[in-house]
Interface confidence: low
């Protein structure tokens, strides 16, 4: 070609028109072009319709082209990657109809001040979205609803002051979230759902440490090894997790995860209390991590946040209380349970030896606590036995978390899903509205027998028991190559709730409570 360099690369025809001072698409490009580089030209405006003759085009680079307007007309049915970074776009064109197969969209370093409702409608295949370095102040609710396959999301270096509570709902594959260097002061309750988010970048925001930050504090404590600092140009091997990088703006850079929350209401102090989200509890088996989450429930509120699943985990999980007002998507309901006045569910249950086993109905037969644990090979899909795992006596981190082994830093922004295999089974859909059960019933749902050999409470001691406790069904899957230390935090802190259904604790659980 007289202007551009044409190369055959595997089954692709790659055309490199970079840095040619072009003001328009060069004529007579090969019709079977699959990859087209138009970077660093002076296009100013560009119409995607001009590319319609190139029916095999899978990748288009239009970065650094001084673009102020991108016209979206026609359809490029197989275009998977579009790089619009480092331009002058002030609005994001609606690409869904034109680019139905798009998997990577990079609009970093433009001049976007807002995104329209439905900005991503039609982009159901999108896996990576980079919006770093724009001027976004808010995001429309439901922005990412059309992109359930999203894996990497960069919103770093914008002017975001708040995030929609349900922004991440349904993003079961999300592994990297970059929110650093914004103007965020809090994270809405339930924001992270039950996702396992391996790479989160949250530093450089003016976090306001007050009672509203307690949900975020708890999430940071439970995900300390997944919080990183973005350092441009630093070798990946030097990158370690750094949860202390997330700092209170109003407390002399005090780490948010250590914020004491003194004076914040606890359950029983105020009627309008709320929940933490459910977090995954993990224990390791050789080089595998088995993720198990268990639900215990004292229902007083209807919790309607739809939880995303990571791989094929159950949506049920351990939870703990969170003082604050109702989530926007929650509605207050009549209290369904009344506990004795002296019952203060502000306790922690450390399960030093705990066994979960699936049973068809509740039983009152004691289950002896195991004293040794045998490693179990790859669990069958219906297997729900959790081997005993030593549990630390303190459930929350009190010192700087140890750096996790050299973990990849996200790319341009990111792309660090290292070499983790794809999930082998489709996650079950997660319900969005739980059905409240007016009458305590447990006979119809599978239960878990819990044998706890030692119980520790902050203020009282009592006899241990092997009396079985009936809990909601817990499922577990094996996730290879998540190299994390074993932990089973069996923590019950007060008010617990499930997003899936509404079982009550077995009445025998009264005997484990400090009276």
């Amino acid at each position: 070609h007289p202007i551009c360099e044409v190369s055959k690369v595997a089954s692709h025809l790659e055309v490199n028109c970079d840095k040619r001072n072009l003001t328009a698409l060069p004529p007579d490009l090969p019709k079977d072009t699959t990859i087209l580089h138009l970077s660093e030209n002076l296009l100013y405006t560009f119409s995607l319709a001009t590319l319609m003759p190139y029916t095999r085009l899978t990748q288009l680079n239009l970065d650094r082209c001084e673009l102020t307007k991108l016209q979206v007309d026609g359809t490029l049915p197989v275009l998977g990657t579009l790089d619009l970074s480092h331009n002058q776009l002030q609005s994001l064109p609606l690409l869904g109809q034109t680019l139905p197969a798009l998997t990577v969209l990079d609009v970093s370093f433009n001049r976007l001040t807002s995104l329209p409702l439905g900005a991503l409608r039609g982009l159901g295949e999108l896996q990576e979205l980079y919006l770093k370095g724009n001027e976004l102040k808010t995001l429309p609710p439901g922005l990412l609803t059309p992109t359930p396959k999203l894996e990497k999301l960069s919103l770093a270096n914008n002017n975001l002051t708040e995030l929609p509570a349900g922004l991440l709902n349904g993003l079961e594959n999300l592994d990297t979230l970059l929110l650093q260097e914004n103007s965020l002061y809090t994270i809405p309750k339930g924001f992270f759902g039950s996702h396992l988010l391996p790479f989160a970048f949250l530093h450089g925001n003016p976090w306001l440490c007050n009672c509203e930050i307690l949900y975020f504090r708890r999430w940071l404590q439970d995900n300390a090894e997944n919080v990183y600092v973005w350092k441009q140009g630093v070798d990946v091997k030097a990158m370690t997790s750094n949860v202390a990088s997330v700092q209170c703006d109003n407390s002399d850079k005090f780490p948010v995860y250590k914020y004491p929350g003194k004076g914040c209401p606890t359950l029983g102090d105020e009627g309008d209390t709320d929940l933490y989200d459910y977090y995954p509890e993990e224990d390791t088996e050789g080089d595998k991590v088995r993720a198990t989450r268990t639900v215990v429930k004292f229902p007083t509120k209807a919790h309607t946040t739809p939880w995303g699943l990571f791989y094929s985990w159950s949506t049920a999980s351990l939870d703990s209380q969170m003082p604050s007002s109702l989530h926007p998507t929650q509605e207050s309901t009549k209290e369904q349970t009344t506990f004795p006045p002296r019952w203060t569910p502000n306790f922690t249950l450390h399960m030093e030896s705990i066994t979960f086993s699936k049973t068809p109905k509740s039983t009152t037969e004691p289950t002896p606590s195991p004293t040794t644990s045998e490693p179990v090979p790859e669990p069958a899909p219906n297997m729900t036995t959790l081997e005993p795992t030593p549990s630390p006596t303190t459930p929350e981190p009190t010192s700087e978390p140890a750096p996790s082994p050299t973990t990849p830093e996200p790319t341009s922004e990111p792309a660090p899903s290292p070499t983790t295999p794809e999930p082998t089974s489709e996650p079950a859909p997660s319900p969005t509205t739980p059905e409240p059960t007016p009458i305590p019933t447990i006979a119809t749902s599978p239960t878990i027998l819990v044998s706890a050999t030692s119980l520790i409470t902050p203020k009282s001691t009592f006899l241990t028991t092997t009396k079985p406790v009936s809990l909601l069904e817990s499922t577990k899957k094996t996730i290879p190559e998540l190299d994390q230390p074993p932990k089973l935090r069996g923590v019950l802190q007060g008010h617990l709730e499930s997003s899936r259904n509404d079982p009550f604790l077995h009445p025998d659980f009264c005997c484990l409570l400090p009276l």
């Epitope: 190369s7 595997a10 692709h12 790659e14 490199n16 990497k152 441009q232 996200p410 790319t411 899903s417």
Partner: nanobody
């Protein structure tokens, strides 16, 4: 600036296997699309395989499909090329390549950084 250093080349009999490694140093290598090229004596440098930043997407030249596998370990800043069922026509100097712009396959004209190469000789 990224420095790329290849290793693992050598002499192998036809039908044998080799694993090439490309160790990268400098800026964050997970920012880069990585690839392998090869240049047989007296011939042009040809694309062999390419891999996305996350390692999820991979592309191969038709001549190596099914025999070669590209992979990367971002934690170790290393890209690998596992070469099985080697043939005498695979004899060449193998070069590691890195490119920052988006895209998995690339012509050598779009490579930002090259390694110095490692020699693979397949004897019949």
């Amino acid at each position: 600036e990224v420095q790329l250093v290849e290793s693992g080349g050598g002499l192998v009999q036809a039908g044998g296997s080799l694993r090439l490694s490309c160790a990268a140093s400098g800026p964050t290598v997970s920012n880069y699309y990585m690839g392998w090229f090869r240049q047989a004596p007296g011939k042009e440098r040809d694309f062999v395989a390419g891999i996305s930043r996350s390692g999820v997407e991979k592309y191969y030249a038709d001549s190596v499909k099914g025999r070669f596998t590209i992979s990367r370990d971002n934690a170790l800043n290393t890209v690998y090329l596992q070469m099985n069922s080697l043939k005498p026509e695979d004899t060449a100097a193998y070069y590691c390549a890195a490119r920052e712009r988006v895209g998995i396959t690339f012509a050598h004209s779009t490579v930002d950084y090259w390694g110095k190469g490692t020699l693979v000789t397949v004897s019949s």
